[in-house]
Amino acid sequence: SVRVEQVVKPPQNKTESENTSDKPKRKKKGGKNGKNRRNRKKKNPCNAEFQNFCIHGECKYIEHLEAVTCKCQQEYFGERCGEKSMKTHSMIDSSLSK
């Protein structure tokens, strides 16, 4: 089963000159020599207005969806990775119940 997450759309204030993009981002491995990056003036919203959006996780901008989402650290979940899983408290709970 797959948990489909919320995505948040950054505000639309792009200019016409910023309207094309040839290389989205995912892999940082070799082979990317900067070719086709002449139109890469657009700012990644994760580095701007969404810089502190993910509380316990990494902000990711998904170009296809024009939206940001959060890759949560272990134990955290929710739209902004702000909620902690209760699973980690099971040992404490069991000791309190004695």
Epitope: R3, K27, K60, I62, L65, E66, T69
Partner: antibody, heavy 125, light 112 residues
């Protein structure tokens, strides 16, 4: 029911132009990236262009870059492909396709989940 | 650019046979343990149809005799027991966020 219907294909001379349209229905159009994929007669599938949900990001292979322009009108649930400086090798059936996707754990998995029936573009003198 | 190579280019099989088609990418299409590879079926004169996404997930409505596996650069599409309607051409496609979004050259599955 998801439906994608292409139109605008036809016979055009080398160097000419053509504009393809794709009318979408049965889903929230502005929530999906869209693409054009073509298939030359008797050949395999070739990706032609992709546009993001709001049109801010467009992508092309080198074979069509500078000649083809993808666009969308979310108010009209329509996708377009403007093809200029057409060549004989652009002869193909052109399909519009929706990018289905899963988003989980910060990962974005996408695939072409719905396709139109295709429209034939023939470039010949 | 990532090149996708399918093998075989064509094969003949009989109804009831188990069939395997392979797809090899010129570089990994994995990212943090996720495989960005899809499989499509196309019949003559028809649009392609999605069978498998993310290497191993069966698309809704696709019969369970179809399955996908693999990771990194090597992937397989398996049809466990071939049915008459399965004779078609099959394509793999990489769906990383790095264009071009390339397809394999196709594998034509014919009746023996």
């Amino acid at each position: 029911e998801v439906q994608l219907v292409e139109s605008g294909g036809g016979l055009v001379k080398p160097g000419g132009s053509l504009r393809l349209s794709c009318a979408a229905s049965g889903f929230t159009f502005n929530s999906y990236a869209m693409s054009w994929v073509r298939q030359a007669p008797g050949k395999g599938l070739e990706w032609v262009s992709t546009i993001s949900t709001g049109g801010s990001h467009t992508y092309y292979p080198d074979s069509v870059k500078g000649r083809f322009t993808i666009s969308r009108d979310n108010a009209k649930n329509s996708l377009y492909l403007q093809m200029n400086s057409l060549r004989a090798e652009d002869t193909a059936v052109y399909y519009c396709a929706r990018h289905g996707y899963l988003l989980y754990d910060g990962y974005y998995e996408w695939y072409f989940d719905y396709w139109g029936q295709g429209t034939l573009v023939t470039v010949s003198s | 650019d990532i090149q996708m190579t399918q093998s075989p280019s064509s094969l003949s099989a009989s109804v009831g046979d188990r069939v395997t088609i392979t797809c090899r990418a010129s570089q990994s299409v994995d990212y943090d343990g996720h495989s960005f590879l899809n499989w499509y079926q196309q019949k003559p004169g028809k649009a392609p149809k999605l069978l498998i996404y993310a290497a191993s997930n069966l698309q809704s409505g696709v019969p369970s005799r179809f399955s996908g596996s693999g990771s990194g650069t090597d992937f397989t599409l398996t049809i466990s027991s071939l049915q008459p309607e399965d004779f078609a051409t099959y394509y793999c496609q990489q769906s990383t966020e790095d264009p071009p979004y390339t397809f394999g050259q196709g594998t034509k599955l014919e009746i023996k």
